[in-house]
C-alpha cells in the first residue's frame, strides 16, 4: 500500500546531517523499517519479539538509527547536493497480523545552509 507523502516533518537537519523520521503506529510490535533513497535501500532495521517478550533489533544495511515506541530515526551525515532525492520509509508489519506493507516519503531538499563543510 502506497500512502504517499508523510503527514509529519520527516527531515530534521542538524550539524551538517539529517535525521530522517519514519513513524509507525505504536500498536505495532514486530516490524521491518527500510529507508529507501529513490528505489535503493539505504538502511533497514527489524524489530522482533522472542519468547518472554525479549526484543531483538537487527540491521542488514546498517545506518546510525534510533528506535522509539512509534518511530525509527535514520541519520545521514556529511550532507552534500547528491543527497537531494526522494526518500521513503518502507514499513513491513509482522505483528499484529495480518502482514501489511506501507510506504511514506518525501523529497529531501538540500540548501547551502544545511551542508556540512561550507567554504566561507
Amino acid at each position: 500500500e502506497i500512502n504517499g507523502s508523510a503527514n509529519y516533518e520527516m527531515f530534521i537537519f542538524h550539524n551538517g546531517g539529517v535525521q530522517i523520521l519514519c513513524k509507525y503506529p505504536d500498536i505495532v510490535q514486530q516490524f521491518k523499517m527500510q529507508l529507501l533513497k529513490g528505489g535503493q535501500i539505504l538502511c533497514d532495521l527489524t524489530k522482533t519479539k522472542g519468547s518472554g517478550n525479549t526484543v531483538s533489533i537487527k540491521s542488514l544495511k546498517f545506518c546510525h538509527s534510533q528506535l522509539s515506541n512509534n518511530s525509527v530515526s535514520f541519520f545521514l551525515y556529511n550532507l552534500d547536493h547528491s543527497h537531494a532525492n526522494y526518500y521513503f520509509c518502507n514499513l513491513s508489519i509482522f505483528d499484529p497480523p495480518p502482514f501489511k506493507v506501507t510506504l511514506t516519503g518525501g523529497y529531501l531538499h538540500i540548501y547551502e545552509s544545511q551542508l556540512c563543510c561550507q567554504l566561507k
Epitope: 500512502n3 503527514n7 503506529p25 500498536i27 506501507t102
Partner: antibody
Framework: EVRLVESGGVLVQPGGSLRLSCAAS????????MHWVRQVTGKGLEWVSA???????YYSDSVKGRFTISREDARNSLYLQMNSLRAGDTAVYYC???????????????????WGQGTTVTVAS | EVVLTQFPATLSLSPGERATLSCRAS??????LAWFQQKPGQAPRLLIY???NRATGIPARFSGSGSGTDFTLTISSLEPEDFAVYYC??????????FGPGTRLEIK
C-alpha cells in the same frame, strides 16, 4: 450489492476431505483480508482461518495442519481445503472479510463488514 | 489468547427500552473491538468497529463505548427487529481471533 457466496458444504465421513469456496462480487476483494468463521447450530461464533492481502495465512489451533486457506484474487475467490475431518468440524461455515489500513502513526481496523450466507458442513458416518 | 466475556448472557426487555450489553477482555485490546448482531438463520452483521464507530447503514440508536478491557454496546430505544444475539469480537491480539459467547436479547 456487496456479496459473498459460499459453496461446497456437504455431508462427509470422518477422515474425509472437502473444499469450500467463497465467491465475492461488488467490492474490492484484493483489499480485504479474508476469513472463515464457523458456527455449530445453537452455539457461538468460532474463528477458523484467515488469509491476508499478501497471502499470509493464519489458523486456529483446532484446525492447524488439517485445513488450508487460499485465495485467488483474479477470480475474487476464497477457498478452504478441509482434510482429516472430524465430527467436531460439523458447523455452518461463513466466509467474511475485513480491512486494515496503516497511515503513518494510525492503524485503522474496519471490522468484518462483509459476510456470506454460510454453507453447512456435516461430518458423520 | 484474548478471552472475551459477555454479560448478561440473556437480557429481557421491551420495545422502547434502553439496552446495555457488556463485553470484557482478558487483556488490554485498546479500542480494537467490534460488535455483531445475529438473527436466527442469518449471518452475523457488523454493527460497531473500533469500539465506537458505527458500520455503514447501522441506525444511530446503536452506539459503542469503552477502551482497554471494558466495552459497552448500547441500544437507546429498542425496536422489534433488534431482538437477536449480540457478539463482541477482537482482532488485535491474534491468532486466534476471538468472539465473546454472546448476549441473547429477548422480548420481555
Amino acid at each position: 450489492e456487496v456479496r459473498l457466496v459460499e459453496s461446497g458444504g456437504v455431508l462427509v465421513q470422518p477422515g474425509g476431505s472437502l473444499r469450500l469456496s467463497c465467491a465475492a462480487s461488488e467490492f474490492i476483494f484484493n483489499s480485504y483480508d479474508m476469513h472463515w468463521v464457523r458456527q455449530v447450530t445453537g452455539k457461538g461464533l468460532e474463528w477458523v482461518s484467515a488469509i491476508g492481502t499478501a497471502g499470509d495465512t493464519y489458523y486456529s489451533d483446532s484446525v492447524k495442519g488439517r485445513f488450508t486457506i487460499s485465495r485467488e484474487d483474479a477470480r475474487n475467490s476464497l477457498y478452504l481445503q478441509m482434510n482429516s475431518l472430524r465430527a467436531g468440524d460439523t458447523a455452518v461455515y461463513y466466509c467474511t472479510g475485513d480491512r486494515t489500513v496503516v497511515r503513518g502513526v494510525n492503524y485503522y481496523y474496519y471490522g468484518m463488514d462483509v459476510w456470506g450466507q454460510g454453507t453447512t458442513v456435516t461430518v458423520a458416518s | 489468547e484474548v478471552v472475551l466475556t459477555q454479560f448478561p448472557a440473556t437480557l429481557s426487555l421491551s420495545p422502547g427500552e434502553r439496552a446495555t450489553l457488556s463485553c470484557r477482555a482478558s487483556q488490554n485490546i485498546r479500542s480494537y473491538l467490534a460488535w455483531f448482531q445475529q438473527k436466527p438463520g442469518q449471518a452475523p452483521r457488523l454493527l460497531i468497529y473500533g469500539a465506537s464507530n458505527r458500520a455503514t447503514g447501522i441506525p444511530a440508536r446503536f452506539s459503542g463505548s469503552g477502551s482497554g478491557t471494558d466495552f459497552t454496546l448500547t441500544i437507546s430505544s429498542l425496536e422489534p427487529e433488534d431482538f437477536a444475539v449480540y457478539y463482541c469480537q477482537q482482532r488485535i491480539s491474534w491468532p486466534p481471533i476471538t468472539f465473546g459467547p454472546g448476549t441473547r436479547l429477548e422480548i420481555k
